[in-house]
């Protein structure tokens, strides 16, 4: 018997009935086995066929036969109901061997010429499967020559039986306080030989109840206990299982913070699987109760581990621990079912006690000592000597626990110093140096140093007067011992004043004459206004208007008299201002350096003469009535003048301070 | 984590006023709770001086109040200490410390003397 | 101002023993008391606060207790660092005030 050719030779090749293309004898019998490559198949098919035709192929046939199937017993030229002829059919091995027997019979009652086949091994595509047969992998099936290979989708692993695909679903941990688990594919079919394993994960002190939802489909058996595939269920007291078949668990009260869920199928079956969805709960804490004036949020039936409220006060209300303020309040429910805080209070917000305002006062108006939230305070400042500075006074306890002005504003309000007060009436003509009697000159400064110099007080803790009175002290401020209050230059009875810092004018150049002849003085402390310590006011844009040629203004100070000494009590003198052109004019003839009077300064006194101010005046102030607002303000500062005081054809030469407003009002507002 | 740090000189001259300075870390003292001032004479109980709130608003021990300042600088995350006048009974360990003592200072001692 | 009363003024324990800490507020102060511990040359440390709360990090063995004008702290089973001085405070009103504190020292 021919076997053909065998795997590794080529394998394709041709057979035909014996003596052909002419007729075959008679009680012939031939048998070929081929024999293909593993993961090949054969295929097979006649180009001529022509035996004799009997019932059922009994007397001549070819038969084709892969192991122990028969392919085809073949006979005739062209199939009939009960017989068949290869006609253009292809046939085919079932594996990688096929067997073809040719028998004729002793008689033939006509010649037949027998057939020609020709065969050749192909690739079996074991990834096409008939219908209804089980396919040749569980998720996707990839053919080659020679063979195929399983591969599966993600989140699975191939088996290693290497078709099926076994889910990779261990080691998912579940820690929300709820959630839903389920197996594999739910709720299509889960997958074959797998083994999985869930864990519920919560913290300390929760409980995992679990609920089976929808459906459950477990493959089962009717007589053995879940033998094929299960569901368990694990907690550190107990085990809960195994389930399976299609009614649906009843609930489980774990009363644990972990569980372990195992589901374990094998190679059969068809089954939806389950679905759980997993809730917990704890040990509840007291019901909060909102402290009066304040609420709860969020609102809950109850409060359980992890869970939390918060605290919020209605306006005019403050979270007060005790004494200490709170800006928030949340408490935590703690797995012993308490608190983790204690419950703040709401407290009516309480503003306190106002602060004294420096030369004012305060009065309760809602109530004698009332500080509570919306309560309302009036500040006002001491009369005639202050005045409040751009503020009405009124204050109320607002939410936040300031006072506040109706402006807004949590600072206290200012009361500014009264300026250009004086006991004095001005007489419209010169009467001649006098002495001053008290309150008419509040603003006056004695300045004790190397020389005695004199100044004006501004507002309540600044002093003005010439750069070369205290030039010398520039760098040691604390020298400069300042008096106010008092007539008599000797005189125990002063308030004493101190200096923290001097500011000369950046355009005096000492000894170089007297431009820029000005500076100021910045007090350690504020002093107390009073009658006799009262700051004189600062020029007015429209004080020109009280300072042209022929207006009188007034200088006072200890400086030498006509006697040739400084006076004991302060004096004054009414003069009036002198025309530019004539000052610049009298000053221009030697011994004075021409260009001695310059638009910085301005003159006055009398061309007869004896009327002036004098050495120990220098540093005071030229003050001049402003009639509208009938109060004193500074014109000049004493400066420079004659070596002979009073002298006829001179002029006492003053600084003119409404040419160094911008400079003043600089330093002021930056020191 | 929450740090505080006291800070300033270690020497002060009576009637002279003693500045403290108060640096936080890891909270911002705007965020919430009172911020106190406490300090512990030398042998002695600790005493409170006062606090500023989380808002800013003061509270004064009154034995102190006509001496005492409390402020605070928001942009440095700090609050200090101004004491007025002080005599040698003013020589203590100053601590600053947050709320009702949950995080403290290591504490800086101050002596008033001459 | 509130005067708070510690007792006693000192303590000798041996180790493993519990120790009783009592203190005394002038005046009605609800449960807001706070204790500390402190030790020479540190700065006091944080135990209990609202009478009975422990801050995290605090061991269990100390605990406190009381309500208005009485408190506790009790520290169950003494260790070698707990010998220091336990200081009250309260801070129910303005002025806050401390204890003189009570010192516990090894028996």
């Known amino acids: 018997t021919p076997l053909g050719p065998k795997w590794p030779e080529p394998v394709f090749g041709r057979l035909a009935s014996p003596g052909f293309p002419g007729e075959y004898a008679n009680d012939q019998e031939r048998r070929w086995t081929l024999t293909a490559p593993p993961g090949y198949r054969l295929r097979l098919y006649f180009t001529h066929f022509d035996l004799e035709l009997s019932h059922l192929c009994e007397y001549d046939f070819v038969k084709l036969s892969s192991g122990a199937k028969v392919l085809a017993t073949l006979c005739g030229q062209e199939s009939t109901d009960t017989e068949r002829a290869p006609g253009k059919d292809t046939f085919y091995s079932l594996g990688s061997s096929l067997d073809i027997t040719f028998r004729s019979d002793y008689s033939n009652e006509k010649p037949f010429t027998g057939f020609e086949a020709f065969y050749a091994a192909e690739d079996i595509d074991e990834c096409q499967v008939a219908p209804g047969e089980a396919p040749t992998c569980d998720h996707h099936c990839h053919n080659h020559l020679g063979g195929f290979y399983c591969s599966c989708r993600a989140g699975y692993v191939l088996h290693r039986n290497k078709r099926t695909c076994s889910a990779l679903c261990s080691g998912q941990v579940f820690t929300q306080r709820s959630g839903e688990l389920s197996s594999p594919e739910y709720p299509r079919p889960y997958p074959k030989l797998s083994s999985c394993t869930y864990s519920i994960s919560l913290e300390e002190g929760f409980s995992v109840i679990l609920d089976f939802v929808e459906s459950f489909d477990v493959e089962t058996h009717p007589e053995t206990l879940c033998p094929y595939d299960f569901l368990k269920i694990q907690t550190d007291r107990e085990e809960h299982g195994p389930f399976c078949g299609k009614t649906l668990p009843h609930r489980i009260e774990t009363k644990s913070n972990t569980v372990t869920i195992t589901f374990v199928t094998d190679e059969s079956g068809d089954h939806t699987g389950w679905k759980i969805h997993y809730t917990s709960t704890a040990q509840p804490c007291p019901y909060p109760m909102a402290p009066p004036n304040g609420h709860v949020s969020p609102v809950q039936a109850k409060y359980i581990l992890k869970d939390s409220f918060s605290i919020f006060c209605e306006t005019g209300y403050e979270l007060l621990q005790g004494h200490l303020p709170l800006k928030s309040f949340t408490a935590v429910c703690q797995k012993d079912g308490s608190w983790d805080r204690p419950m703040p209070a709401c407290s009516i917000v309480d503003c306190g006690p106002p602060d004294d305002l420096p030369s004012g006062r305060v009065e309760y108006i809602t109530g004698p000592g009332v500080t509570t939230y919306k309560a309302v305070i009036q500040y006002s400042c001491e009369e005639t000597f202050y005045t409040m500075k751009v503020n009405d006074g009124k204050y109320v306890c607002e939410a936040d626990g300031f006072w506040t002005s109706s402006k807004g504003e949590k600072s206290l309000p200012v009361c500014e110093p009264v300026c250009g007060l004086s006991a004095r009436t001005t007489g419209g003509r010169i009467y001649g140096g006098q002495k001053a009697k008290p309150g008419d000159f509040p603003w006056q400064v004695l300045i004790l140093g190397g020389t005695t110099a004199a100044g004006a007080l501004l507002y309540d803790n600044w002093v003005l007067t010439a750069a070369h009175a205290v030039y010398e002290q520039k760098h040691d401020a604390s020298a400069l011992d300042i008096r106010m209050g008092t007539l008599k230059r000797l005189s125990p009875h002063y308030t004493q004043a101190w200096s923290e810092a001097v500011f000369i004018h950046e355009g005096y150049t000492h000894d170089a004459g007297f431009d820029n002849d000005i500076a100021l003085i910045k007090l350690n402390n504020k002093v107390v206004i009073n009658s006799n310590i009262t700051p004189i006011c600062l020029p007015r844009k429209e004080a020109e208007s009280f300072m042209r040629t022929d207006d009188i203004g007034t200088a006072s100070g200890w400086g030498l008299t006509q006697r040739g000494f400084l006076a004991r009590n302060l004096m004054y003198v009414d003069i009036p201002i002198v025309d530019h052109q004539k000052c610049t004019a009298a000053y221009e003839k030697p011994p004075y350096p021409r260009g001695s009077v310059t638009a910085n300064m301005l003159c006055a006194g009398l061309e007869s003469g004896g009327k002036d101010s004098c050495r120990g005046d220098s540093g005071g102030a030229l003050v001049f009535l402003d009639s509208e607002t009938e109060r004193w303000f500074v014109g000049g500062i004493v400066s420079w003048g004659s070596m002979n005081c009073g002298e006829a054809g001179q002029y006492g030469v003053y600084t003119k301070v409404i040419n160094y407003i911008p400079w003043i009002e600089n330093i002021i507002s930056d020191f | 984590q929450v740090q505080l740090q006291e800070s300033g000189p270690g020497l002060v001259k009576p009637s002279e006023t003693l500045s403290l300075t108060c640096t936080v870390s890891?909270?911002?003292?705007?965020?919430?709770?009172?911020w106190n001032w406490i300090r512990q004479p030398p042998g002695k109980k600790l005493e409170w001086m006062g606090y500023i709130s989380y808002s800013g608003r003061t509270s004064y021990n009154p034995s102190l109040k006509s001496r005492i300042t409390i402020s605070r600088d928001t942009s440095k995350n700090q609050f200090s200490l101004k004491l007025s006048s002080v005599t040698a009974a003013d020589t203590a360990v100053y601590y600053c410390s947050r709320h009702y003592g949950d995080y403290w200072g290591q504490g800086t001692l101050v002596t008033v003397s001459s | 101002e509130i005067v708070m009363t510690q007792s006693p003024a000192t303590l000798s324990v041996s180790p493993g023993e519990r120790a009783t800490l009592s203190c005394k507020a002038s005046q009605n102060v609800g449960t807001n008391v706070a204790w500390y511990q402190q030790k020479p040359g540190q700065s006091p440390r944080a135990l209990i606060y609202?009478?009975?709360y422990r801050y995290s990090g605090i061991p269990a063995r100390f605990s406190g207790s009381g309500s208005g004008t009485e408190f506790t702290l009790t520290i169950s089973s003494l260790q070698s660092e707990d010998f220091a001085v336990y200081f009250c405070h309260q801070y129910n009103s303005n002025p806050l005030t401390f204890g003189g504190g009570t010192k516990v020292e090894i028996k």
């Open positions: 890891g909270y911002s003292i705007t965020s919430d709770y009172a």
């Open positions: 609202s009478a009975s």
